[in-house]
């Protein structure tokens, strides 16, 4: 018995070959002996029932001369899964057709961290297994239902699912979009007084994007977090609903989501969490944003450099006179030099030698006051 696997909605070709490689009389039947179609010696295709009933069934006339009399079934349905009989040259050929479909149980647009369920739609009597490969090459295998929990950004793209039935295979492709921000977390390093730009680019593109969002901020100096801004998103247009008075944030009207803080101040240093709830989706997108603020000051005979905000313990804070070795260098959030010599001093925040933030302060001879360029 020949086995053919097909995909729902597509076409299948059921083979029937003559040993003589020439046109001959043939008939295709259902297993209950109802006639589907055939050729009775005049080279004309004759259908077994009403056109509406058999309009999905056809053969390849061009192949008849070569002794091939396939049954073509178009717009395959699950109910087409059965045994078909080809009668020719006083023999009967049985061809078993199984029709399958692989679908994403939920929407194909899923939030990062959510679960994806892939379902193999199969007819009664089938014994399939399915193996799906994610865009990042991860394989999952199972029966008729496969689940992937905690979707990641790299899971966005084309999933390839191979259905196996009696050693035969049929392949399905499903496009999955993982809705997420491009970065889970970002850090902005700023000198005191500088303007701060926060950007929240999305890792996906959709024609219409509607939802609402909010930025909650936990300042390092504050005991509790507070909502800095709430906004709506309608067809990729951003409109601010409510904004705190301190700081007075500004928000861009177009994507990517963009926030401007007029100036970096120590009291704003800390961590924020931007959440975006999308229309018709359960759950929210999250991006963490961190602000580190640096201040260099000279008070009487003390030159001080401080940073506020979430810094890693491996970051180095240094004070050095321009073109000279660092006078002081510590894995701390404040460093100082007593009785600094005159000249341009640099405060540097660095990570393994890479400067993340620097602030310059000019120390004048002791009879004058310091100048901050």
């Amino acid at each position: 018995k020949t086995l053919v696997l097909g995909k729902e909605g597509e076409s299948a070709e059921l083979p029937c070959e003559s040993s003589q490689k020439k046109i001959t009389v043939f008939t295709w039947k259902f297993s209950d002996q109802r006639k589907i179609l055939g050729q009775h010696g005049k080279g004309v295709l004759i259908r077994g029932g009403s056109p509406s009933q058999f309009d999905r069934f056809d053969s390849k006339k061009g192949a008849w001369e070569k002794g091939s009399f396939p049954l073509i079934i178009n717009k395959l349905k699950m109910e087409d899964s059965q045994t078909y009989i080809c009668e020719l040259e006083n023999r009967k050929e049985e061809v078993e057709l199984w029709v399958f479909k692989v679908t994403a149980n939920s929407d194909t647009h899923l939030l990062q961290g959510q679960s994806l369920t892939l379902t193999l739609e199969s007819p009664p009597g089938s014994s399939p297994s399915v193996q799906c490969r994610s865009p990042r090459g991860k394989n999952i295998q199972g029966g008729k239902t496969l689940s992937v929990s905690q979707l990641e950004l790299q899971d966005s793209g084309t999933w390839t699912c191979t259905v196996l039935q009696n050693q035969k295979k049929v392949e399905f492709k499903i496009d999955i979009v993982v809705l997420a921000f491009q970065k889970a977390s970002s850090i902005v390093y700023k000198k005191e007084g500088e303007q701060v730009e926060f950007s929240f680019p999305l890792a996906f593109t959709v024609e219409k994007l509607t939802g609402s969002g909010e930025l909650w901020w936990q300042a390092e100096r504050a005991s509790s977090s507070k909502s800095w801004i709430t906004f709506d998103l309608k067809n990729k247009e951003v409109s601010v609903k409510r904004v705190t008075q301190d700081p007075k944030l500004q928000m861009g009207k177009k994507l990517p989501l963009h926030l401007t803080l007029p100036q970096a101040l120590p009291q704003y240093a800390g961590s924020g969490n931007l959440t975006l709830a999308l229309e018709a989706k359960t759950g929210k997108l999250h991006q963490e944003v961190n602000l580190v603020v640096m201040r260099a000051t000279q008070l009487q005979k003390n030159l001080t450099c401080e940073v506020w905000g979430p810094t890693s313990p491996k970051l180095m804070l240094s004070l050095k006179l321009e073109n000279k070795e660092a006078k002081v260098s510590k894995r701390e959030k404040a460093v100082w030099v007593l009785n600094p010599e005159a000249g341009m001093w640099q405060c540097l925040l660095s990570d393994s030698g890479q400067v993340l933030l620097e602030s310059n302060i000019k120390v004048l001879p002791t009879w004058s006051t310091p100048v901050q360029p």
Epitope: E121, S122, P123, G125, S126, S127, S129, K144
Partner: antibody
Framework: QVQLVESGGGLVKPGGSLRLSCAAS????????MNWIRQAPGKGLEWVSY????????FYTDSVKGRFTISRDNAKNSLFLQMNSLRAEDTAVYYC??????????????????WGKGTTVTVSS | EIVMTQSPAALSVSPGERATLSCRAS??????FAWYQQKPGQAPRLLIY???TRATGIPARFSGSGSGTEFTLTISSLQSEDFAVYYC?????????FGQGTKLEIK
């Protein structure tokens, strides 16, 4: 433990309607294909309907086509059978049953292993 | 549809003895075949699937054999709780079908 509990059976006049429910517990309902099977009094078993885990693939036996509708609500772990235009010959105990599978290497074996206790439907004038 | 024919319709066997139940399919069902046990007022209980694989929790005294069109259920040493009606079942072609049942009675 895995459990299927049918409800909604009762006495109905010919031509009437009934909606049977099957409440599933003890397993992830949305992962499984489900079935309705019936048994007429003192008679053998008859497979009524088959539904895929997503609810997108459905099959009925010829005697109920156009009259019965199988459906499921995965969020509520429930399977349903809406029975319209009921006939005397639909009188039976209706069971809901889960399709299970076991696998050996790449080969998967499917079978109907878990059944509910059944609910009785009587169609009589 | 595939017609399943069970024989005998009834079988009287003494406890401790061996019982052999047969089932014939009107066309090949490969090994997509199962045996069920049903006691009065209860739902059928799966004994054997894939023609010869014992379901979870089924004692080793139950064994299934055959493929294609001829199948056999053997109960090696009958216990009092084994007296019931046994149904064979094919799940190769839709509609799935059952045999008419074999009633296993105490002799």
């Amino acid at each position: 433990q895995v459990q299927l509990v049918e409800s909604g059976g009762g006495l109905v006049k010919p031509g009437g309607s009934l909606r049977l429910s099957c409440a599933a517990s003890g397993f992830t309902f949305s992962d499984y294909y489900m079935n309705w099977i019936r048994q007429a009094p003192g008679k053998g078993l008859e497979w009524v309907s088959y539904i895929s885990s997503s609810g997108k693939t459905i099959f009925y036996t010829d005697s109920v086509k156009g009259r019965f509708t199988i459906s499921r609500d995965n969020a509520k772990n429930s399977l349903f059978l809406q029975m319209n235009s009921l006939r005397a010959e639909d009188t039976a105990v209706y069971y809901c049953a889960r399709e299970d599978y076991s696998n050996y290497e790449d080969y998967y074996y499917y079978y109907t292993g878990v059944w509910g206790k059944g609910t009785t439907v009587t169609v009589s004038s | 549809e595939i017609v399943m024919t069970q024989s005998p319709a009834a079988l009287s066997v003494s406890p401790g003895e061996r019982a052999t139940l047969s089932c014939r399919a009107s066309q090949s069902v490969s090994s997509k075949f199962a045996w069920y046990q049903q006691k009065p007022g209860q739902a059928p209980r799966l004994l054997i699937y894939n023609a010869s694989t014992r379901a979870t929790g089924i004692p080793a005294r139950f064994s299934g054999s055959g493929s294609g069109t001829e199948f056999t259920l053997t109960i090696s040493s009958l216990q009092s709780e084994d007296f019931a009606v046994y149904y064979c079942h094919q799940y190769k072609n839709w509609p799935y079908t059952f045999g008419q049942g074999t009633k296993l009675e105490i002799k």
